[in-house]
Interface confidence: low
């Protein structure tokens, strides 16, 4: 299943399978989740180790059992894969990161005044994997704002290195942000030229196409089909790319598909997996497994379910069958695919799904209606569990924020339904930023069933949850795709990065804002709540979050959405926008329902017809 | 200060054709649904029709249905109504309103209001 | 379409009297009810919005109640400023409808 855990001073000892230098443990826990082999992994921050060379190093591991011992060694990060973690598996990563150099092929300079557009810059280009950025205040003049756009061979930094007045991040390509557009067209009977990156074995261009995408250097494909006139050429997928970025020449060629890598798209990228089924086709690799199982759909969940498997084999062969079962043979190879590809056999095969975004783990639960004060823009993709609740009567506005919490569930809060329960004149629109690209045309969500907790009273501020279930599930996306949920009754977690987000007010008396606003606020403790407002109970099923110095808040508009607080590099809902008195006002911190002391609630109803979770806690 | 002003009304002959306008000013009109009200003399309010905030989407009493086109220019900031085959019952008080304030709470602010007149 | 029926049609009151006046919807409107003031010769004016909000700025000495089909607009003491002609409105479907008006006049 899907382990999140974070193991803080510890490293596992032995497994590696391969190892590079990456800015924190969050990236390299995304490059574990994209190795084909990695199922642990270990980062040494710069502060916990003197050895240069060893400083930011990201170890991969395998383990035949799953687990690896662990040794203590101060201030190293261990975790595991987020294979079969559904929504979270992602290749976006955004953080910047500041006094840290990534060393790498550097192939672009440019001055630019901030490092925003650095990372823009490396977005829209091509070839760019990550930048550096020399601040205003870099020790050197002449490189003052120089951005610096690099790539390697691997993707990752050949070296990182700690240097004052230097930011550094990556490209957000793999966030479907790029402007550059891509290329959809299969070529058929065509081969390009240029420089091989890797070589592999798959079924269709399909397949090659997305492993290109998700390769670091692929930018376009040649694909020979099963009937190329080369036997030991056959199925072979070239990942390609050029200096220039796309291909220097295309020769015709009968019985080969060319391409290009899809990670310029904007807005859509493939998913990581492969959940195609090929039958009259054996994929041979190293066996890992053998089970008796009804069905190749099975065969692929008993693949899916065991973290290892890559691609497998259903055998239709009588001697591998007995009653209505059949052999499903569960195999692994060193780069993830099949080591040889037979075709006109009695067998079905296909690939783990364990890189989906879509598998039922879709959930990892790991007085006045408020209202965002003193925030900023967010970008696409920044938020993806927020969404806008509308109402749509004469004319259609947003009311409330919300969080999509499953494929089907969206948490928000009870006051917003005061007088509105009827679930035809809602609107749910998901995966959005600016509430000015709604049109008629804008798909929307239908509600199927509002549940407002069972203890909510209009006008008062207690137990202000509510559950919407949608008419049909939503899929998940880079800019559409549900919040962690905290374990159940969390009080030991000590949150000190949580933000707000929503459409609400600017201002006690203003209107609702068009792009999706965004505001970092601290936690306040419930005694220094309770002590802020004496005429209402703070109960410890609220928590509350502002400044003393008030001028930041959330404000109408944005009740019923989301409080986040990042820890160990997830991001959790820990509260629901609720009430507050007024906005931003001094001493006046906001009130949000705490998600932790009702998971219960919420885990019950989201229980489906056949009584099976359709979220689960965080191990 | 948020402000609706109409313009456009007058003396038109039965079957004749007029376009009123509505100028908006003070907030953001480009996010805000679009109405038109009217009053007949001496009697009470009547919706006549209304405008999504992009334009998209429109709708009309039954009473002016394939004769009264609304539309709105975001780029100008303003609202207007194209009437044809006008008919005495027409005869009104035009008012510009939107629902600026609080979600579902009703129109607000109006303008001043133009006077249609249809008489031959 | 929900028809929107007030009464009474007109009522005389003096300055300083506490006045009601009620609105019937056809069916359930919930909450989407909203009161306007409207004086000769000038544009309606919005005094509650969802049957019981005060809009900004008018006086507290006007509030309304009700939900579903019956509403009702107070004026807790009638002011020389407040003899006009009120109507109520429905915003829970379209099309939205007016009541046809309730005139308060001087005694």
């Known amino acids: 299943g899907c382990l999140t855990q974070l193991y803080e001073n510890a490293f596992f000892r032995g497994g590696d399978v391969a190892s590079m230098y990456t800015p924190n443990a969050q990236y390299c826990q995304m490059r574990c989740t994209f190795h084909p082999r990695c199922l642990l992994f270990s980062f040494l921050p710069a502060s916990s180790i003197n050895d240069m060379e060893k400083r930011f190093g990201c170890f991969l591991k395998d383990s035949v059992t799953g687990t690896l011992p662990k040794v203590h060694r101060t201030g190293a990060v261990s975790g595991h894969s987020l294979k079969q973690c559904g929504h979270q598996i992602s290749a976006c990563h955004r953080d910047i990161y500041k006094g840290v150099d990534m060393r790498g092929v550097n192939f672009n300079v440019s001055k630019v005044s901030s490092v925003e557009e650095c990372q823009k810059r490396c977005t829209s280009n091509i070839r760019c994997q990550f930048f550096s950025y020399a601040t205003q205040t870099f020790h050197k003049a002449e490189y003052r704002n120089n951005c610096l756009l690099k790539y390697s061979p691997g993707g990752t930094p050949t070296a990182i290195k700690v240097l004052s007045n230097v930011e550094s991040g990556f490209s957000l390509k793999p966030c479907a942000l790029s402007e550059i557009g891509c290329h959809m067209n299969i070529f058929q009977h065509l081969a390009f030229s240029d420089v091989d990156v890797a070589r592999v074995l798959t079924p269709d261009a399909f397949v090659c196409r997305t492993i290109c995408t998700y390769h670091p250097n692929c930018l376009f494909f040649t694909f020979y089909t099963n009937v190329w006139k080369i036997e030991s050429q056959r199925n072979v997928c070239l990942l390609k790319t050029s200096e220039s970025g796309t291909p220097s020449s295309s020769t015709p060629q009968e019985n080969t598909i060319s391409g290009y890598s899809l990670l310029t798209c904007k807005r859509t990228l493939p998913e990581p997996c492969h959940s195609k089924i090929y039958p009259g086709v054996d994929f041979g690799g190293e066996e890992l497994n053998v089970t008796f199982v009804k069905g190749v759909n099975v065969c692929q969940e008993t693949c899916t379910k065991m973290i290892r498997c890559q691609f497998f084999t259903y055998s239709l062969l009588p001697e591998d069958c007995k009653e209505e079962k059949c052999k499903c043979f569960l195999r692994l190879s060193m780069d993830g695919s099949p080591t040889r590809i037979a075709y006109g056999t009695q067998g079905s095969s296909g690939y783990s799904l364990r890189l989906c975004n879509t598998g039922d783990n879709s959930v990892c639960t790991t007085k006045t209606s408020t209202r965002i004060v003193g925030g900023t823009n967010s970008s696409w993709g920044e938020w993806p569990w927020q969404v806008s609740l509308q109402v749509k009567l004469t004319a259609q506005r947003h009311l409330c924020g919300g969080s999509l919490i499953g494929h089907q569930w969206v948490l928000t809060a009870a006051h917003c339904f005061d007088g509105l329960p009827l679930q035809d004149v809602w609107r749910i629109y998901s995966g959005i930023l600016n509430l000015s690209d709604i049109t008629k045309d804008t798909p929307f969500s239908q509600i199927k069933e509002i549940i407002i907790h069972q203890n909510y009273k209009v006008s008062e501020g207690n137990h202000d949850i509510a559950l919407i279930k949608l008419q049909a599930p939503l899929n998940y996306t880079e800019f559409q795709k549900p919040i962690c949920l905290p374990s159940k009754g969390d009080t030991s977690t000590i949150y000190t990065n949580c933000w707000v987000t929503g459409w609400g007010f600017s201002k006690e008396k203003g209107e609702i804002q068009n792009i999706l606003q965004k505001v970092n606020i601290p936690l306040v403790t419930n005694e220094e709540c309770q002590k802020r407002y004496q005429d209402y109970k703070i109960t410890q099923r609220m928590v509350c979050a502002g400044y003393k110095e008030g001028g930041k808040d959330a404000c109408k508009g944005d009740s019923g959405g989301p409080l986040v607080c990042k820890h160990n590099g997830m991001w959790r809902l820990v509260g629901i926008t609720s009430w507050g008195e007024g906005c931003a006002r001094r001493e006046q911190p906001g009130v949000y329902t705490k998600v932790a002391e009702y998971m219960d609630w919420i885990l019950e109803k989201t229980q489906s017809s056949d009584g099976k979770a359709q979220m689960q806690s965080p191990a | 200060e948020v402000q609706l002003l109409e313009s456009g009304g007058g003396l038109v002959q039965p079957g004749g054709s007029l376009r009123l306008s509505c100028a908006a000013s003070g907030f953001t009109f480009s996010w805000y649904p679009m109405t038109w009200v009217r009053q007949a003399p001496g009697k009470g309010l009547e919706w006549v029709s209304s405008?999504?905030?992009?334009?998209?989407?429109?709708i009309y009493a039954d009473s002016v249905k394939g004769r009264f086109t609304i539309s709105r220019d975001n780029s100008k900031n303003t609202l207007y109504l194209q009437m044809n085959s006008l008919r005495a019952e027409d005869t009104a008080v035009y008012y510009c309103?939107?629902?600026?304030?609080?979600?579902?709470?009703?129109?607000?602010?109006w303008g001043q209001g133009t006077l249609v007149t249809v008489s031959s | 379409d929900i028809q929107m029926t007030q009464s009474p049609s007109s009522l005389s009151a003096s300055v300083g009297d506490r006045v009601t006046i009620t609105c019937r919807a056809s069916q359930s409107i919930s909450s989407y009810l909203n009161w306007y003031q409207q004086k000769p010769g000038k544009a309606p004016k919005l005094l509650i919005y969802a049957a019981s909000s005060l809009q900004s700025g008018v006086p507290s000495r006007f509030s309304g109640s009700g939900s579903g089909t019956d509403f009702t607009l107070t004026i807790s003491s009638l002011q020389p400023e407040d003899f006009a002609t009120y109507y109520c409105q429905q915003s829970y479907s379209t099309p939205p409808t007016f009541g046809q008006g309730t005139k308060v006049e001087i005694k």
């Open positions: 309103t939107t629902e600026y304030g609080d979600y579902g709470g009703g129109f607000d602010p």
């Open positions: 405008i999504g905030p992009s334009g998209g989407q429109t």
